[in-house]
């Protein structure tokens, strides 16, 4: 089942997806698509990287983290209700059926009439470190047989990191969106 992420209309949505490159700059092609992950690639591709750079993107979709270090989390700018749905992050690790795929569910809520800007600024300042810390919260590490020098650390679940904290409830209740950058 997909992990659920929330954002408000007009805010930026953040969908986390990470991997650990075998060596700095030794990148793996990644695609993001709207819709559940199919057998190959991503359906309805919104962004794609190769071993060097982002080589395809559509407006409002970008990687705000350091994708050269394996942070391929997707930011969707200025979301609308139409952005709700399942998104696929696929990490195309070379080899036979090695690629990893993650389905993330984005729920867009109507904007609050009176947002709490002070609190939101605090969250924005507090979370970038936490979001990009590989050792934070439960993580599942899988060593891939045909590519033993790549450890894929799935921290595609920001919700898991936050679920047990009061901050998570705070975020959910206030409807604030975590914005990176």
């Amino acid at each position: 089942s997909e992990v659920e992420y929330r954002a408000e209309v007009g805010q930026n949505a953040y969908l986390p997806c990470f991997y650990t490159p075998a060596a700095p700059g030794n990148l793996v092609p990644v695609c993001w698509g709207k819709g559940a992950c199919p057998v190959f690639e991503c359906g309805n591709v919104v962004l794609r990287t190769d071993e060097r750079d982002v080589n395809y993107w559509t407006s409002r979709y970008w990687l705000n983290g350091d994708f050269r270090k394996g942070d391929v989390s997707l930011t969707i700018e200025n979301v609308t209700l139409a952005d709700s749905g399942i998104y696929c992050c696929r990490i195309q690790i070379p080899g036979i059926m090695n690629d990893e795929k993650f389905n993330l569910k984005l729920v867009i809520k109507p904007a609050k009439v009176t947002p709490a800007p002070t609190r939101q600024r605090d969250f924005t300042a507090a979370f970038p470190r936490m979001l990009t810390t590989r050792g934070h919260g439960p993580a599942e590490t899988q060593t891939l047989g045909s590519l033993p020098d790549i450890n894929l650390t799935q921290i595609s679940t920001l919700a898991n990191e936050l679920r047990d904290s009061r901050l998570a409830n705070d975020l959910r209740d206030s409807g604030a969106t975590i914005r990176i950058g």
Epitope: V28, G35, A36, C42, E51, I96
Partner: antibody
Framework: EVQLVESGGGLVRPGGSLKLSCVVS????????MHWVRQAPEKGLDWIAY?????????????YYADTVKGRFTISRDNAKNTLFLQMTSLRSEDTAMYYC?????????????WGQGTSVTVSS | QIVLTQSPAIMSASPGKKVTLTCSAS???????LYWYQQKPGSSPKLWIY???NLASGVPARFSGSGSGTSYSLTISSMEAEDAASYFC?????????FGGGTKLEIK
């Protein structure tokens, strides 16, 4: 104009080997995943292998095989030569078919959108 | 693996008649990844309908596709001679991708 041209088919004895090629033109080959699909005489279509695109080097691809050919067939590509390959070993009579290469279009329709004309493989003693 | 069953296996239709071909999946398929291909004798398959209901480039508007879950269909609103061909459905929602056995559509 997008074109895919298969070659390398022929008559081979059971247990033998054959290497199929598919030369493409009209699009940036390295950007696209590619499939091999076969069709036995008077039968339906049977997907057999896929190799991803979007990689700078041909060796950085993700590969998928159908269980029926796993361990016997090897899909590969040479991006510099715009060519897709299918190395077939330990061939069996049930591998007799027309073999098609097809492009996987992730940009628009995101599926097997263009197919070659096919190359015929007959496995018989 | 998901088995796609197409029915009927063979059918004949008179010009001007409405034709419906069905594709039934053994388990649920995402509608985004259900496709139809047309193939004429001696030719390679052509992409005909993608993502359940979208017509590929050059496909006449008399064709339509619909469905969800395990039940999908291709409809021709008014049969024409050039529509005589075999039609195959494909799913690539789940590994391995699978094709239906095909429906051979003939003109009466």
């Amino acid at each position: 104009e997008v074109q895919l041209v298969e070659s390398g088919g022929g008559l081979v004895r059971p247990g033998g080997s054959l290497k199929l090629s598919c030369v493409v033109s009209g699009f940036t080959f390295s950007d696209y995943g590619m499939h091999w699909v076969r069709q036995a005489p008077e039968k339906g279509l049977d997907w057999i292998a896929y190799i991803s695109g979007g990689s700078i080097s041909s060796g950085s691809s993700t590969i998928y095989y159908a269980d029926t050919v796993k361990g016997r067939f090897t899909i590969s590509r040479d991006n510099a030569k715009n060519t897709l390959f299918l190395q077939m070993t330990s061939l069996r009579s049930e591998d007799t078919a027309m073999y098609y290469c097809a492009r996987h279009d992730w940009r628009g329709l995101y599926a097997m959108d263009y197919w070659g004309q096919g190359t015929s493989v007959t496995v018989s003693s | 693996q998901i088995v796609l069953t197409q029915s009927p296996a063979i059918m004949s239709a008179s010009p001007g008649k409405k034709v419906t071909l069905t594709c039934s999946a053994s388990s649920s398929v995402s509608s985004s990844y259900l496709y139809w291909y047309q193939q004429k004798p001696g030719s390679s398959p052509k992409l005909w309908i993608y993502s359940t209901s979208n017509l590929a480039s050059g496909v006449p508007a008399r064709f339509s596709g619909s469905g969800s879950g395990t039940s999908y269909s291709l409809t021709i609103s008014s049969m024409e001679a050039e529509d005589a061909a075999s039609y195959f459905c494909l799913q690539w929602s789940s590994y391995p991708p699978t094709f239906g056995g095909g429906t051979k559509l003939e003109i009466k």
